[in-house]
């Protein structure tokens, strides 16, 4: 499975995107920024193996493809750059979903990084409620692209545990 | 190791132009933006304003706009303060500093050793 | 534009001291406030963020509290490298403003 080449790609052209999707200076969003506490010490403090990495990036690509996909989203970004962003995910998803399956075999599923998947999840969540609370607002928005293309960055130790050889 | 290395120090005649620079190396230059701060002689520190190297936007403090211009060079991981016509007022200690834009991180973390600009006739 | 008002703008102290310094915003910032020590010669240094995180590297005896628009920075027991100015910023909004400094001598 060769996923760190065409992923780092993958990964790059939709921070790209997510980049350009901007559409109001951030300058004007500055008293919304918030405290999402994406999980990064956990992440740090762990060495991950490939199977494991697989399925957290997984969750956290399939996390952003969701937050990206409602109607709320779409009301949001221009809409040519919104699919464009999504379909760069998607691909993500099934380079990840093709990897797990040549890695683990079709039956196997790794069980042993719930814990790390229940922690994204989480922190989709207060992404969520974050723009719940915020009515879905023009800087809601901006402080929720920036947020994610930093979780994208962080999730660099991620990508180290899928060059490893189990 | 985060660093911001500002050019050298300068002395200018009244009416002259300048641009200084700021280099930034060891993070990701455009994940940040780069604000400017003035300190005039045995005074404080005051705002000038801040680039997002990313995509150039730039915002500026009242007491600045129009009396400086801001730019940044993301090929090369360089911002920039510029003026067209010095005045005397001008001579201080110019800084630059590192800002984690709409995230939640520490606000200027990292500063430029500062570049002296000394404008007299 | 927000003002920021720092106090007192300079204090004599000895080492050991406990020494508090304040700042007042003219509106509301929540936590938005960020502290700095600068020495003569040298850039400004972060030591606290967001009102009470503490930087990366910075000693422990520095602690800030406060929220809304009175903030106040503590050194619980103040050492030699200590005597510096010390700034108080707003970085809730744009013009981003800094407090006029308190300078910390020795007595």
């Known amino acids: 499975c060769d996923l760190p080449q065409t992923h780092s790609l993958r990964n790059r052209r939709a921070l790209i995107l997510l980049a350009q999707m901007g559409r109001i200076s951030p300058f004007s969003c500055l008293k919304d920024r918030h405290e999402f506490r994406f999980p990064e010490e956990e992440f740090d403090g762990h060495q991950f193996q490939k199977t494991q990495a697989i399925s957290v990036l997984h969750e956290m690509i399939q996390q952003t493809f969701n937050l990206f996909s409602t109607e709320d989203s779409s009301a949001a970004w221009e809409q040519s750059l919104l699919e464009k962003f999504s379909t760069e995910l998607y691909q993500q998803l099934n380079d990840l979903e093709a990897c797990v399956i040549q890695e683990v075999g079709v039956e196997e599923t790794p069980l042993m990084n719930e814990d790390f998947i229940l922690a994204v999840r989480k922190y989709f969540q207060r992404i969520t409620l974050y723009l719940m609370e915020k009515k879905y607002s023009p800087c809601a928005w901006e402080v929720v692209r920036a947020e994610i293309m930093r979780s994208f960055s962080f999730s660099t130790n991620l990508k180290k545990g899928l060059r490893r050889k189990d | 190791e985060v660093q911001l290395v500002q050019s050298g120090a300068e002395v200018k005649k009244p009416g002259e132009s300048l641009k200084i620079s700021c280099k930034g190396s060891?993070?990701?230059?455009?994940?940040?933006?780069i604000g400017w701060v003035r300190q005039m002689p045995g005074k404080g520190l005051e705002w000038m304003g801040i680039?997002?190297?990313?995509?150039?936007?730039?915002a500026y403090s009242p007491s600045f706009q129009g009396q400086v211009t801001i730019s940044a060079d993301k090929s090369i991981s360089t911002a920039y303060l510029q003026w067209s016509s010095l005045k005397a007022s001008d001579t201080a200690m110019y800084y630059c500093?590192?800002?984690?834009?709409?995230?939640?991180?520490?606000?200027?973390?990292?500063w430029g050793q500062g570049t002296l600009v000394t404008v007299s006739s | 534009d927000i003002q920021m008002t720092q106090s007192p703008s300079s204090l004599s102290a000895s080492v050991g001291d406990r020494v508090t310094i304040t700042c007042r915003a003219s509106?509301?910032?929540?936590?938005?406030l960020n502290w700095y020590q600068q020495k003569p010669g040298k850039a400004p240094k972060l030591l606290i963020y967001?009102?009470?995180s503490l930087q990366s590297g910075v000693p422990s005896r520095f602690s800030g509290s406060g929220s809304g628009t009175d903030f106040t920075l503590t050194i619980s027991s103040l050492q030699p490298e200590d005597f510096a100015t010390y700034y108080c910023?707003?970085?809730?909004?744009?013009?981003?403003?800094f407090g006029q400094g308190t300078k910390v001598e020795i007595k």
């Open positions: 500093a590192r800002h984690p834009g709409l995230n939640w991180a520490p606000d200027f973390d990292y």
């Open positions: 680039i997002d190297p990313s995509d150039s936007d730039t």
């Open positions: 910023q707003q970085s809730y909004d744009f013009p981003l403003t």
């Open positions: 967001f009102a009470s």
């Open positions: 509106q509301s910032i929540d936590g938005s």
């Open positions: 060891g993070y990701s230059f455009t994940s940040y933006w």
